[in-house]
């Protein structure tokens, strides 16, 4: 269903003060400036729709230029509780508290929010990324240490009149950025509480949020250059499919990844790429300005629509799934990494997907909207697309039902 219903006050229109409030790049995440404490301490915070904790560096770390100093905040309250978050690789741990938080280029409000003050971490902060914390925008079910810790966005909506919705426009540069360019570059927009029409073209198409934990959606069909991968659609969502701004790549379940790579290889067979390219290990390079985008196929993901038996498709270009990487050794060339990779935890629609689209996280109506981003990288022949409707039967069967376990034992 397209976004043609009557406009609701406060949810549509122009949000000039929030446009261009993100910086960064797909490889190291997009961040927004936030302030915490009294007097306000300014930090850059990674925008992550794949987690639910607001967590900030609160102790010196070799990769941090600055960190949250709780002792300097008159409004900090200690919750006297620790939090430990292990990832498949790495971890962070810290101490829970609350403090006053605001977003300078966001809604003109201040909220008291839960903050995890990170005191120790491993493989969490990224050297040169320029962010000092993470804003988990997903639901309480996956918050640590448990779902009783209210996520930031829930606190924001409860304490203010901000509508229960945010939208993201992540803008991939299309070329590698050095450190100074990143600091000066525009990375995109996080519109809190609404939708900005200037950030997309065409119509918004919505897919239901299957379950409010991650932003879980259902993929019903996958095509490479219009050719159906012809897999049981359950495979596409095994064990889930999520929209995650904190992940760089489009990550696909093993079987789906293998089928997709086979199909992309076949479509681009005019050149022989090394096995290491498909693994994400080797770069491929072309003389500057000569990248043969046309030999690479478009990739379409069909998402469950809002109406029974109706789906729509989002289509990305190689300009989204080939990630530009700077390498001094081959600086005379344009070099790229293959940004589709294998996953053991389901499909992750990361920055590779999101950089093609304006994505609306309509929590109020339990749905996610996609429209073609006004800033997506394309060429004169092809553009990213959001199209529908398509008739698709038995879409409910595409969802995978994860056997019930204690969520707290799962690795993120």
């Amino acid at each position: 269903e397209t976004d043609e219903e009557p406009e609701e006050p406060g949810r549509r229109g122009s949000f000039v003060e929030m446009v261009d409030n993100l910086r960064g790049k797909s490889g190291q995440g997009y961040y927004v400036e936030m302030t915490v404490g009294s007097p306000p301490q300014t930090l850059n915070i990674l925008v992550d729709t794949g987690s639910s904790n607001f967590a900030v560096g609160a102790a010196p770390h070799p990769f941090l230029h600055r960190y949250y100093q709780r002792q300097l905040s008159s409004t900090y309250r200690d919750l006297r509780k620790g939090v430990y978050v292990p990832y498949t690789q790495g971890k962070w741990e810290g101490e829970l508290g609350t403090d006053l938080v605001s977003i300078p280029h966001g809604p003109n409000v201040t909220v008291r929010a839960n903050i995890a003050a990170i005191t120790e971490s491993d493989k969490f902060f990224i050297n040169g990324s320029n962010w000092e914390g993470i804003l988990g925008l997903a639901y309480a079910e996956i918050a640590r240490p448990d779902d009783s810790l209210e996520p930031f966005f829930d606190s924001l909506v409860k304490q203010t009149h901000v509508p229960n919705l945010f939208s993201l426009q992540l803008c991939g540069a299309g070329f590698p950025l050095n450190q100074s360019e990143v600091l000066a570059s525009v990375g995109g927009s996080m519109i809190i509480g609404g939708i900005d029409h200037s950030l997309y073209t065409g119509s918004l198409w919505y897919t239901p949020i299957r379950r409010e934990w991650y932003y879980e959606v259902i993929i019903v069909r996958v095509e490479i250059n219009g050719q159906d991968l012809k897999m049981d659609c359950k495979e596409y969502n095994y064990d889930k499919s999520i929209v995650d701004s904190g992940t760089t790549n489009l990550r696909l379940p093993k079987k789906v990844f293998e089928a997709a790579v086979k199909s992309i290889k076949a479509a681009s067979s005019t050149e022989k790429f090394p096995d290491g390219f498909w693994l994400g290990e080797q770069l491929v390079c072309w003389q500057a300005g000569t990248t043969p985008w046309n030999i690479f196929p478009v990739i379409s993901l069909y998402l469950m629509g809002e109406v029974t038996n109706q789906s729509f498709r989002i289509t990305i270009l190689p300009q989204q799934y080939l990630r530009p990487v700077e390498d001094v050794a081959t600086s005379q060339d344009d070099c790229y990494k293959f940004a589709i990779s294998q996953s053991s935890t389901g499909t992750v629609m990361g920055a590779v997907i999101m950089e093609g689209f304006y994505v609306v996280f309509d929590r109020a109506r339990k749905r996610i909207g996609f429209a073609v981003s006004a800033c997506h990288v394309h060429d004169e022949f092809r553009t990213a697309a959001v199209e529908g409707p398509f008739v698709t039967l038995d879409m409910e069967d595409c969802g995978y039902n994860i056997p019930q376990t204690d969520e707290s034992t799962l690795m993120t």
């Epitope: 498949t88 050297n127 022989k272 090394p274 096995d275 290491g276 080797q282 390498d327 050794a329 070099c335």
Partner: antibody, heavy 116, light 107 residues
């Protein structure tokens, strides 16, 4: 500029293990894989395996799979190669190299001598 | 595993000579071949990637050609600093494999 600095020479007894380090600088560490290649005295180059510093994913040459272990410490931008059950034919210079297109950057090498 | 067979194993040449080294892959590796130069007691230095592209800073006298199974490294006018051992390498598939090396000596 890109630099890969390896740990110093080692002398080990047969059956022992050795752990060689490779500290990277001058680029975004998690963007590029690190490979290990060895060269026995007067011989050619032999690829041992590689690791992705962003997630510690490893891939080994079948010949070394049972004895080599690659690990990474992102906080210090260092990759380690441990080789166990050493024998005299493991005497070689061990190089780390950074990926890109093929292997554009190499460490200075670490001589490992296995002798009783 | 893909075998990379280099020839000759050694050659003698004079400063200013044109030198050609060949490398044959046991199966099709596309253009996914690199060339390295190694001097005694030093680590390999990368020269050529994708069969014919020079890495940044490599002098233009070094050139590469070939695709499929047959590859060539050419030094158009040998300089004193070019006396070294040269290796080809395929990075088309794992495990990466190298030629046995060609030693370029002073005549």
């Amino acid at each position: 500029q890109v630099q890969l600095v390896q740990s110093g020479a080692e002398v080990k007894k047969p059956g022992a293990s050795v752990k060689v380090s490779c500290k990277a600088s001058g680029y975004t560490f998690t963007n590029f894989w690190i490979h290990w290649v060895r060269q026995a005295p007067g011989q050619g180059l032999e690829w041992m395996g590689m690791i992705d510093p962003s997630d510690s994913y490893t891939k080994y040459n079948q010949k070394f799979k049972a004895r080599a272990t690659l690990t990474v410490d992102t906080s210090t931008s260092t990759v380690y190669m441990e080789l166990s059950s050493l024998r005299s034919e493991d005497t070689a210079v061990y190089y780390c190299a950074r990926s890109g297109v093929s292997l554009p950057y190499w460490g200075q090498g670490t001589l490992v001598t296995v002798s009783s | 595993d893909i075998q990379m067979t280099q020839s000759p194993s050694s050659l003698s040449a004079s400063v200013g000579d044109r030198v050609t080294i060949t490398c044959k892959a046991s199966q099709d590796v596309g253009r996914n071949v690199a060339w390295y130069q190694q001097k005694p007691g030093k680590s390999p230095k990368s020269l050529i990637y994708s069969a014919s592209h020079r890495y940044s800073g490599v002098p233009s006298r070094f050139s590469g050609s070939g695709s499929g199974t047959d590859f060539t490294l050419t030094i158009s006018s040998l300089q004193p600093e070019d006396f070294a051992t040269y290796f080809c390498q395929q990075y088309n598939s794992y495990p990466y494999t190298f030629g046995q090396g060609t030693k370029v000596e002073i005549k």
